[in-house]
């Protein structure tokens, strides 16, 4: 990605998805009535004109928000503690890697707007998720809906990261 982001960052992202998958506690088939449109800002991760600062910012804010969401008393009561600890550790490592990169990208003079704008959008999205959990009284099904929503949004965000990587590889080889 054009900075000292370790090669295993993509692997860590995939591990996070695997952990979120393993955290499943009840059959999702029981929770259809609790589905909700959280309005994930797809346009933020689907664009073809990917700026390095934008990608870094989206990934950093995503991981920061996931870390916060799964680092609460309510979350500890809902999930298997061993898996939750592994999730926290993995997210913490990825955040450290991304922070190093973000500092470098900002140092290279990339637009501050490319960093602040996605962060605000994602905060609103995650606030909607928190409101939903509270409204549903942190039920097992509410957490299950949120777990699957986070998996979807993280999958889309890491896809965006892979697209930037491919673009960088193509530029490097031409």
């Amino acid at each position: 990605l054009g900075c000292d982001l370790p090669q295993n960052h993509g692997l860590l992202s995939r591990n996070t998805l695997v952990l979120l998958h393993q955290m499943r506690r009840i059959s999702p088939f029981l929770c259809l009535k609790d589905r909700r449109d959280f309005r994930f800002p797809q346009e933020m991760v689907k664009g073809s004109q990917l700026q390095k600062a934008h990608v870094m910012s989206v990934l950093h804010e995503m991981l920061q928000q996931i870390f916060s969401l799964f680092h609460t008393e309510r979350s500890s009561a809902a999930w298997n503690m061993t898996l939750l600890d592994q999730l926290h550790t993995g997210l913490h490592q990825q955040l450290q890697h991304l922070e190093t990169c973000l500092l470098q990208v900002v140092g290279e003079g990339e637009s501050a707007g490319a960093i602040s704008s996605p962060a605000l959008t994602l905060r609103r999205y995650f606030q909607g998720i928190r409101v939903y959990l509270k409204e549903k009284k942190y039920s097992d099904c509410a957490w299950e809906v949120v777990r699957m929503e986070i998996m979807k949004s993280l999958f889309l965000s890491t896809n965006m990261q892979e697209r930037l990587r491919s673009k960088d590889r193509d530029l490097g080889s031409s």
Epitope: P28, L32, R35
Partner: antibody, heavy 121, light 107 residues
Framework: EVQLVQSGAEVKKPGESLKISCKGS????????IGWVRQMPGKGLEWMGI????????AYSPSFQGQVTISADKSISTAYLQWSSLKASDTAMYYC??????????????WGQGTLVTVSS | DIQMTQSPSSLSASVGDRVTITCRAS??????LNWYQQKPGKAPKLLIY???SLQSGVPSRFSGSGSGTDFTLTISSLQPEDFATYYC?????????FGQGTKVEIK
């Protein structure tokens, strides 16, 4: 391009076994459930059951529980519907369709072309 | 299981007509209702999801409304390609269930 491609038409005798398939492509196969729907000749749509290919968790309509088995092989992005002992009343068109699970997205937005199963002695 | 009842079971209409099909659920399904169109020998096609959301690529003459137990599919101006069978389906709970279908025929 998202596609669900089903296996070809089958002609079987009562008492025989059968396994039909539905192969997904153009999307993350484990991110969507696969549902199966029956349509008997000249009749309406009947929901049979569903599978989450990420872990092969299944749910069946009470009418089809014990009559059929739904399975999936995520390594080849394929879901299956099988019978251990066919009856003449199993003669129908069978469709697979993808479902977004608990994610908010259109339900059953892509369907297979259907597999016609004919059971006759 | 939640029962879905469609009416009418069939109707005859002309090109340009406004057509309305209703679907009633045996218990509240909030807005978890989908509408499908099926033509002979073809797989069903999703038209409307979540009671009123138009599926991508579906013409705007199709619209859906309702919540709770009573739902409506409206075709504002019937086109030749709209002659088909229409099904509603509840999506709030397993087992998913379909209405018996409404066949729209040429008058």
């Amino acid at each position: 391009e998202v596609q669900l491609v089903q296996s070809g038409a089958e002609v079987k005798k009562p008492g025989e076994s059968l396994k039909i398939s539905c192969k997904g492509s153009g999307y993350s196969f484990t991110s969507y459930w696969i549902g199966w729907v029956r349509q008997m000749p000249g009749k309406g749509l009947e929901w049979m059951g569903i599978i989450d290919p990420s872990d092969s968790d299944t749910a069946y309509s009470p009418s089809f529980q014990g009559q059929v088995t739904i399975s999936a092989d995520k390594s080849i992005s394929t879901a299956y519907l099988q019978w251990s002992s066919l009856k003449a009343s199993d003669t129908a068109m069978y469709y697979c369709a993808r479902h977004p699970g608990l994610n908010w997205a259109p339900d059953f937005d892509y369907w297979g072309q259907g597999t016609l199963v004919t059971v006759s002695s | 299981d939640i029962q879905m009842t469609q009416s009418p079971s069939s109707l005859s209409a002309s090109v340009g007509d406004r057509v309305t099909i209703t679907c009633r659920a045996s218990q509240s399904i909030n807005r978890f209702l989908n509408w499908y169109q099926q033509k002979p020998g073809k797989a069903p096609k999703l038209l409307i999801y979540a009671a009123s959301s138009l599926q991508s690529g579906v013409p705007s003459r199709f619209s859906g409304s309702g919540s709770g137990t009573d739902f409506t599919l409206t075709i504002s101006s019937l086109q030749p390609e709209d002659f088909a069978t229409y099904y509603c389906q509840q999506a709030i709970d397993l087992p998913f269930t379909f209405g018996q279908g409404t066949k729209v025929e040429i008058k």
